[in-house]
Structures are given as C-alpha cells and as structure tokens.
C-alpha cells in the first residue's frame, strides 16, 4: 500500500503519500476551528507509470497508452485512496461543540 | 456532472471529460482482443480550482490550500468518477469467447 509505512521511509518519485501539515488560520484562512490549530492532512503526488498501483482497468490502460504515446496528455493521476476523519472543536457563540469532519486525512494513495 | 453532455459541448480548461479513442494494437500493443479493434476510452484532465467538483473534504481543503499557497505542489487532481465496462471478443486458440472488461470507459470526472 502507498501509505506512510511505505512512502515516508522510501524516497519515491512515483505516486506516494506525502506529508503535509495544514495550519487552519495561515493556510486556509479558517478562524472558526479552535482546536486543533492544524493537522497532518498529507497529500498524494508522483508519477503513475504502467502498473504502479493502478486503481482500475482504465488507469492501467491509460498508463500503458502513456508509455507507448509519451507525447499524449492522457495519463493517470496520483490521488487519495483511504481517508480518515478529523475531530475538531468549534464554538456556537460561547457554546463549545465537537464535530467529526469526514475525509480530512489522507492515509494512502493510488493511480487513478 | 463533468460528463460528455457537459464537457464535450463546452471548451473547459478545468477538470472535465476528454475524448480519447484507443486502438488496441497500435496504442497498447494488445493483439489478444479481436473485437472491437478499439474503443472510446475517454480520460479526465484539467485544473482543479477551489470548489470545482471536489470529491471529498480533503480535496476541498487541498484546493483552498493551493489557492493560498500557489507555489505548493499539493493540489487535487482530475480523475475518473463513473466508469463503464467494455464487451470484447477474444480467442482461446480457435475458440471464440466473449468477456466484459470492467471499468474500461470513463463517463465522468471529479477533482480528488
């Protein structure tokens, strides 16, 4: 799996999970989240050569097409596969509320 | 939806469905599929600005992050959403067989 266990331990130009810390105020302009101040969102990036963690038959076809036709703009892209939620604290006036924001943290990647 | 009905009628730089015909022999080097000789595979391509057909909360966060930090390499990518199968004719020796290959045709796209 193209997850932290593999990607953070290997220098990998191909599609892999990359570390990314997001500060809510600085990076997103969000002032409404009180806790946490930021989080490890991570992201997916890297090349998708033939058979590198292809998601579907179409992405396999596309990466093979791209190998044979390298000048073409059609190629698979490295995107998130498994995502996890993030629990946040925010306020309604003076009343604290806890909410779980779904699909906030990328845990693994795929070529799609 | 970023499908043929929308994307093939509009000139769109942002993430959208693009037409792509694949000839099995010429483009993939596949001789084993006897019919069809090729098919309209299509592909997804284009920019993913903030809120342009974002797939998850993470892709919305990432596109907003990318707007505020344009020099960053972290940004969502335009990938396939709905896919359809393709029915093919192949041979076992001299015996013809029909098979449905799943996820071969892209019908719509998303920013993920």
């Amino acid at each position: 799996a193209l997850d932290a266990a593999y990607c953070f331990r290997n220098v990998q130009d191909n599609c892999c999970l990359r570390p990314l810390y997001i500060d809510f105020k600085r990076d997103l302009g969000w002032k409404w989240i009180h806790e946490p101040k930021g989080y490890n969102a991570n992201f997916c990036a890297g090349a998708c050569p033939y058979l590198w963690s292809s998601d579907t038959q179409h992405s396999r076809v596309l990466s093979l097409y791209n190998t044979i036709n390298p000048e073409a703009s059609a190629s698979p892209c490295c995107v998130s596969q498994d995502l996890e939620p993030l629990t946040i604290l925010y306020y309604i006036g003076k009343t604290p509320k806890i909410e779980q924001l779904s699909n906030m943290i990328v845990k693994s990647c795929k070529c799609s | 939806a970023l499908d043929a009905a929308y994307c093939f009628r509009n000139v769109q730089d942002n993430c959208c469905l693009r037409p792509l015909y694949i000839d099995f022999k010429r483009d993939l080097g596949w001789k084993w599929i006897h019919e069809p000789k090729g098919y309209n595979a299509n592909f997804c391509a284009g920019a993913c600005p903030y809120l342009w057909s974002s797939d998850t909360q993470h892709s919305r966060v990432l596109s907003l992050y990318n707007t505020i930090n344009p020099e960053a390499s972290a940004s969502p990518c335009c990938v396939s959403q709905d896919l359809e199968p393709l029915t093919i004719l192949y041979y076992i020796g001299k015996t013809p067989k029909i098979e449905q290959l799943s996820n071969m045709i892209v019908k719509s796209c998303k920013c993920s």
Epitope: - | L28, W30, W32, Y90, E99
Partner: nanobody, 126 residues
Framework: EVQLVESGGGEVRPGGSLRLSCVVS????????IGWFRQAPGQEREGLGC????????WSADSVKGRFTISRDNVRNTVYLQMNALKPEDRGVYYC???????????????????WGQGTQVTVSS
C-alpha cells in the same frame, strides 16, 4: 525483462512420454498467454496448444488432442506440456512463446506472441 526458458526435451521411444517445462519471468502476476509450438526440420512452426495464465483456459490442436495436455503452476511461474503416446512425427524443436499483455485468452498463431524461448529438442525413434 520477459524471459521464457524451456526444458525437458530429449530422446524417447514411440509410445513414450515427456513433460516439457516453460519457466516464465517478467510477466505481471497471473496474467499473460503462453503458447506451445514445434518446428520439424524443413517445416513451418506449428501451434500445438496454449493456455491463459489467469483462468487456466486451454486449447489443443487437433493433431495432438488427447495426447498432449497443457497446464500451469502460477506459483512456480511455469507452464507444462505433457506429451503422451509420442509418435515419430512428433519430433522437432519445441518452443514456448508468451504474450504478457493478454488479460484473457491465448492464441494459436505464432505472430501474436512477442517473446520466445530458446527451444528444446524432442526426438522420437525406436
């Protein structure tokens, strides 16, 4: 890198048996088609049979049906040609050929295979 290596050829009496092996490397797991061919002196290469590695579907030419059987062992990445009731006309160089792109099926035509083994000699004489 795709490679096919045959072994198991030799000399046998009419009515005898041989099992040829073709070790396949460089193929995607369980995918691809393997064909067996033979070439007798001064003759065209003849398709004997083939197998789809994924689902194990096989085909045998009429000339060897009931005598020759093709099987696969995907763990060992090996395809076998079991030859029984051998006849003098079965002599020749036996080749295995591979098409790693095949998701399904296998061909009886030599032109559809990109990769070939070095061949193994089979002699049938009393």
């Amino acid at each position: 890198e795709v490679q096919l290596v045959e072994s198991g050829g030799g000399e046998v009496r009419p009515g005898g048996s041989l099992r040829l092996s073709c070790v396949v490397s460089g193929f995607t797991k369980d995918y691809g088609a393997i064909g067996w061919f033979r070439q007798a002196p001064g003759q065209e290469r003849e398709g004997l049979g083939c197998i789809a590695r994924k689902d194990g579907d096989t085909w045998s030419a009429d000339s060897v049906k009931g005598r020759f059987t093709i099987s696969r062992d995907n763990v060992r990445n090996t395809v076998y040609l079991q030859m029984n009731a051998l006849k003098p006309e079965d002599r020749g160089v036996y080749y295995c050929a591979g098409d790693p792109s095949a998701l399904y099926g296998c061909s009886d035509r030599s032109s559809e295979y990109q990769y070939w083994g070095q061949g193994t000699q089979v002699t049938v004489s009393s």
